[in-house]
């Protein structure tokens, strides 16, 4: 069967600084050259783009300047890193990967990431 | 709102081309891939073609490859389809679709006929 | 290329019936997407993953499959449910439909 499986985890916990990482793994059925990885977040059935990043196999991945996201590529593997994280944008996070070249083009869909985010409290005002 | 309008179609001999446009509004034109679908009188849908993101990846179905060309220019938020050496059996309605985050042809245009006759 | 064979062909039936579309792959299929169209408009996405509803789209229609075979049910026809239904592929090039099931009022 020539499909192509996506895996990432089901759950990840942002940090205190609102940073969250996981990983997007593809069972690749071809030899692409060119692959497109972008996250998608899924909230009450509306699905948004928060960033996406085209990259040749065995180059770096490269967002655009203002993404709020970062990741590097190993292989069939692609660690992705979402920053600027607040509770309001706790969802599922869905991790898509296109194989754009050479044809076949294939598509996969990860089940998505929840990730959490917590807003840290406020610090209390210190007396020296 | 989101919408997609062809333009583009008429009557053109056998042997000869054609160019149809495809206006997007609504959404962010460059984040998405673009298709063109036809649809000959009477039968089924066929998928003719697809244009990536910034336009560097390009497919075709078969009986139109090395006779068709699809492009877009992101600036105008426009998808194109030049149509060479048309030939009767590619009488049909032309419809241009958004392939949606998730995949699916989410978005169609109204569609726009081409009639090859002589 | 995958070859989508839906069936059957035609479905004769009455406002407030149930019905049951079939689409069959000639190989596994990763994402199967449904569409509805009315004579004169453009195709209009039902279901995308097989079972997923798009947007606007009411709850009695309902998709359900995987791997080769899928099904596309609507559980009580509305008049304006009439009309002709395709699948379609979309994990792999070439993009493929269905011929077609022609939902006729009986």
């Known amino acids: 069967c020539k499909a192509m499986h996506v895996a990432q985890p089901a759950v990840v916990l942002a940090s205190s600084r609102g940073i969250a990482s996981f990983v997007c793994e593809y069972a690749s059925p071809g030899k692409a050259t060119e692959v497109r990885v972008t996250v998608l977040r899924q909230a009450d059935s509306q699905v948004t783009e928060v960033c996406a990043a085209t990259y040749m196999m065995g180059n770096e991945l490269t967002f655009l300047d203002d993404s709020i996201c970062t990741g590097t590529s190993s292989g069939n593997q692609v660690n992705l890193t979402i920053q600027g994280l607040r509770a309001m944008d706790t969802g599922l996070y869905i991790c898509k990967v296109e194989l754009m070249y050479p044809p076949p083009y294939y598509l996969g869909i990860g089940n998505g990431t929840q990730i959490y985010v917590i807003d840290p409290e406020p610090c209390p005002d210190s007396d020296f | 709102q989101v919408q997609l309008v062809e333009s583009g179609g008429g009557v053109v001999q056998p042997g000869r081309s054609l160019r149809l446009s495809c206006a997007a509004s609504g959404f962010t034109f460059s984040s998405y891939g673009m298709h063109w679908v036809r649809q000959a009188p009477g039968t089924g849908l066929e998928w003719v073609a697809v244009?990536?993101?910034?336009?560097?990846?390009?497919y075709y179905a078969d009986p139109v490859k090395g006779r068709f060309t699809i492009s877009r220019d992101n600036s105008k938020n426009t998808l194109y389809l030049q149509m060479n050496s048309l030939r009767d059996d590619d009488t049909a309605v032309y419809y241009c679709a958004r392939a949606g985050d998730l995949g699916a042809f989410d978005i169609w245009g109204q569609g726009t006929m081409v009639t090859v006759s002589s | 290329e995958i070859v989508l064979t839906q069936s059957p062909g035609t479905l004769s039936l009455s406002p407030g019936e149930r019905a049951t579309l079939s689409c069959r792959a000639s190989?596994?299929?990763?994402?199967l997407a449904w569409y509805q169209q009315k004579p004169g408009q453009a195709p209009r996405l039902l279901i995308y993953g097989a079972s997923s509803r798009a947007t606007g789209i009411p709850d009695r229609f309902s998709g359900s499959g995987s791997g080769t075979d899928f099904t596309l049910t609507i559980s009580r026809l509305e008049p304006e449910d009439f009309a002709v239904y395709y699948c379609q592929q979309y994990g792999s090039s070439p993009w493929t439909f269905g011929q077609g099931t022609k939902v006729e009022i009986k």
């Open positions: 244009i990536w993101y910034e336009g560097r990846n390009k």
């Open positions: 190989q596994s299929v990763s994402y």
